[in-house]
Interface confidence: low
Amino acid sequence: KLTIESTPFNVAEGKEVLLLVHNLPQHLFGYSWYKGERVDGNRQIIGYVIGTQQATPGPAYSGREIIYPNASLLIQNIIQNDTGFYTLHVIKSDLVNEEATGQFRVYPELPKPSISSNNSKPVEDKDAVAFTCEPETQDATYLWWVNNQSLPVSPRLQLSNGNRTLTLFNVTRNDTASYKCETQNPVSARRSDSVILNVLYGPDAPTISPLNTSYRSGENLNLSCHAASNPPAQYSWFVNGTFQQSTQELFIPNITVNNSGSYTCQAHNSDTGLNRTTVTTITVYAEPPKPFITSNNSNPVEDEDAVALTCEPEIQNTTYLWWVNNQSLPVSPRLQLSNDNRTLTLLSVTRNDVGPYECGIQNELSVDHSDPVILNVLYGPDDPTISPSYTYYRPGVNLSLSCHAASNPPAQYSWLIDGNIQQHTQELFISNITEKNSGLYTCQANNSASGHSRTTVKTITVSAELPKPSISSNNSKPVEDKDAVAFTCEPEAQNTTYLWWVNGQSLPVSPRLQLSNGNRTLTLFNVTRNDARAYVCGIQNSVSANRSDPVTLDVLYGPDTPIISPPDSSYLSGANLNLSCHSASNPSPQYSWRINGIPQQHTQVLFIAKITPNNNGTYACFVSNLATGRNNSIVKSITVSASGTSPGLSA
C-alpha cells in the first residue's frame, strides 16, 4: 500500500522536511503533490512526468520544494504555514490513479526564557512570591527547577497559568535558593539563568556568648551577640536597661562588682522592621586574697610535739581546703581539722609529716591555693649503725669504722673504746692495729636540737688466729619444695676465705645451691628431704684455719601417700584384722582411720578381732602433718568370707 512518511514529523521553523514515499507502484506515468488531504488543482504544488522527467510547478509551489524521481518531496526553509497534510497523486500507465496522504507539524525554535518576580525581597512568614517564566509561547511546556532539582511537593508551592507561573506562599528562609524555568516544545528546550530568591528574615532571638555568667573582679568582660537575620542585624547593648552602644560586641575591661547586672542584646533588622532581645545576668565576684599558712611550731620534735597549721586570712562564710603532698588530706587519727577547716593540727608529728602542705580558699568560681609549706620535723638520732660489719681483724691492718644514725638535724658523733672517749668524728681510723686494739668500740650519736643520744657497741677482736666459726640460719625448719634456706658463716672477718662442706664432702654442683657474700652465705633453694644433712663451714687466712660444728638441716616434708600393710584384701570370717598404716613424713604424721566413711580411732594401727562379713567395706587411712600443713590418704577394700568359702587368712 502506498504510504507517506514525514522525516522528521515535528519540524523546526527554518529547517527542512522530507516526505518519503513507500511502496511506490511499478509502471507509472507520473505523479503530483498537493497541499491538503485531497487532490485539488488549485492546491497543486508540483507535478512530474516520468517519461520526460519533467517537473511542473503548480499554484501552491513556493520555490522551496524539490521533487525526486522516486516521488519523494523535500521542502526547505520550513515556515509555520507549512504545517499540515500533503497528498501524493500517482498516475499509473494504465491510467489507474492511487493516492496517499502524509503530514508534519511545524514548531518555532524557542528563545532562552527568563524569570520575572513580583517581589524581589519578600519577608519570611509574611509575603508570597510569584515567579513567571517569560516569554509566553504557544504550544510550549513550562518546567521549574529549584537548586537544579525538580520542584518538591509542598502545599506552599503552586503552579498556575499553564505552569508558567510558580507561586511560593508564606516564604521562609529555606526558600532562599536558585530558581530556573525551562520551556519545551517538540523541537527545542531552553533553560533560563538562575534567579536567587533573597528572603528577608529575622532577627531570631539573639544568642549571647560566651555562656558563662560568673566573672571575677579584674577580668575583662567580652560579650558577643549574634542573631540569624537577613540582612544582617544591627545590634545594641543595654546594661540594667540603660543603652550602652550599637555594636555586636560589648567589651568592658577590668570589671568590678559594680558591673554585675542584666545585660541585654537587641537585634534589629531594618528591612523586616523586627526587633528581638536576649538578656543574660552577669555576676562579678570580688577577688579573694591569696591565702598563706602560719604554723605555731616551726621545728617540732618527732613523737613529742603537735603542730597547728592555720590558713590565713580569716574570711567569713568561706570554705577552707587542705592538701598534703598535692593530695587531699588522708584519713588519720593524727590529723585534726577545726570546725571551720581553717586550722589543721598534726598530733605527735613524725619525720614523714614534712609535707608539703597547701591550703586553699574556695569561692564561687575557683579555688585559690597558698604557697606550699614544708615542716622541719626534728627527729632521732635512731640507733647508729657501725660499718663495716667485720668483728675480727688481723694485726698490722688499718681499722676504719664509720658510724651513721638517721637524725634531723644531722647527729654529732663520738667514739669510745672500752668506755674511754676517743674522738668526736663520724669516722674512727686506727692504723697498723695490734692485739691490744681488741675491745668494745662504742659509737654515740647525739641530736643537739632534741637533746637525744643513742649508742651502738661493737666487739672488735684483733688476732692472728681465726676464731671457731658458727653457722646461723634464716629458717630452722624449712618446708620441702617450698622454702629456701640461707646458712651464714659467722663471724665476718677481713681477708678471710670461707669454705663449706656437706656430710664431710665439698659442695656438690647443683642449680639449687648458691654461694654469695664472698662465699660466706650458702643458699639452698626449694629444699628437699635429701637436703637434711650435716653442714659445716670453715674460715681460713694465711695464718690459720678453723671449722664450725656441724649443723643438721631439719627439712619438714610429707606426709607422702600412706601404705597399708599387710597388702591382703580377703579374709575369712573369725580372723583378726590388724592393719598398719605408714607414711613418710617429718615430723611424724597423725594417723586416723575411717571404715565406710565413718571415723574410727586416731592410731597408726587398726585392730578388729574376729571379723565377720559385716566387716566388709572400704578402709581409709588419713595422715596429716601439722608442720607442713599437708594431708594425704589411701583407701583399701576388705572382703570377709564366711568360714570355708574362700582361702582367706587368719591373723
Epitope: S209, C225, H226, P231, P232, T247, E249, F251
Partner: antibody, heavy 119, light 107 residues
C-alpha cells in the same frame, strides 16, 4: 597575655600532607574560635577555615574544603590544621588567628608557619 | 565570595603625613569591615574592627570610617613605626575575605 605559638617550618613534596599546630595560652581556650589564614609569597591573606574548640564545629572556605581538616585537643589547648594533596602553589605562610569579636574579627595571630612544597 | 578591592596598592609618605587607604567591597557588608597591619617580619596585628572600633592599645592616630561598600583607614600623622602593609577584611559573609593590601613606604 594571649599567645598563639605555632609549630616550625615544613618542607613537603607535591601530593604529600602537612599538619601544623597552634598552641593557645592566656585566655579561656574553649570560648573563642580559632581560624587559619594563609599568605603565599608576596601575596595577600586568604581565609582557610575555623573551629570552635568547645564542640569541635568547623567551617571551611569552599576552595579548601576537600583538602583542609581542622581538629582540636582541648587537653593541651592546641588546634591543628592538616592540609593534604599539596601542590607547589600551596607554598605559603600559614597563620592561626583567634576570633575574639564575632563576625570574623581576628584579634590575635600566631607567628606563622612557612610550608614549602617542592619536588 | 565578596571581592575586596584595596587602593592604592602602595604609597610613599613622610613622617607626620596624613595617610588614607580605601577599601571597596563587591556588595554591602553592613559595618563588618576590619583593618590589620603586617610588619615586614610577618607579624599581623588587628587595628580597627567593625568599621571604626579602635582596638585597645592601638594609637588614636588610626581611625576607620565608611558604610555600605566603601570604607577608609586614616592615619592622621604617620609615625616611623607605621611603615608596614595594611589589609582590609570583611566579616559579613562566609568566607571572610581580605583586600590585596596597601604597602606604606618611607618617601
Amino acid at each position: 597575655e594571649v599567645q598563639l605559638v605555632q609549630s616550625g617550618a615544613e618542607v613537603k613534596k607535591p601530593g604529600a600532607s602537612v599538619k601544623v599546630s597552634c598552641k593557645a595560652s592566656g585566655y579561656t581556650f574553649t570560648d573563642f574560635y580559632m581560624n587559619w589564614v594563609r599568605q603565599a609569597p608576596g601575596q595577600g591573606l586568604e581565609w582557610i577555615g575555623d573551629i570552635f574548640p568547645k564542640n569541635g564545629n568547623t567551617d571551611y572556605n569552599r576552595k579548601f574544603k576537600d583538602r583542609a581538616t581542622l581538629t582540636v585537643d582541648k587537653s593541651t589547648s592546641t588546634v591543628y590544621m592538616e592540609f593534604s594533596s599539596l601542590r607547589s602553589e600551596d607554598t605559603a605562610v600559614y597563620y592561626c588567628a583567634r576570633s575574639g569579636y564575632g563576625n570574623y574579627v581576628f584579634d590575635y595571630w600566631g607567628q606563622g608557619t612557612l610550608v614549602t612544597v617542592s619536588s | 565570595d565578596v571581592q575586596m578591592t584595596q587602593s592604592p596598592s602602595s604609597l610613599s609618605a613622610s613622617v607626620g603625613d596624613r595617610v588614607t587607604i580605601t577599601c571597596r567591597t563587591s556588595q554591602d557588608i553592613n559595618i563588618y569591615l576590619n583593618w590589620y597591619q603586617q610588619k615586614p617580619g610577618g607579624a599581623v596585628k588587628l587595628l580597627i574592627y567593625y568599621r571604626s572600633g579602635l582596638l585597645s592599645g592601638v594609637p588614636s592616630r588610626f581611625s576607620g570610617s565608611g558604610s555600605g561598600t566603601d570604607y577608609t583607614l586614616t592615619i592622621s600623622s604617620l609615625q616611623p613605626e607605621d611603615f608596614a602593609t595594611y589589609y582590609c577584611q570583611q566579616g559579613n559573609t562566609l568566607p571572610p575575605t581580605f583586600g590585596g593590601g596597601t604597602k606604606v613606604e618611607i618617601k
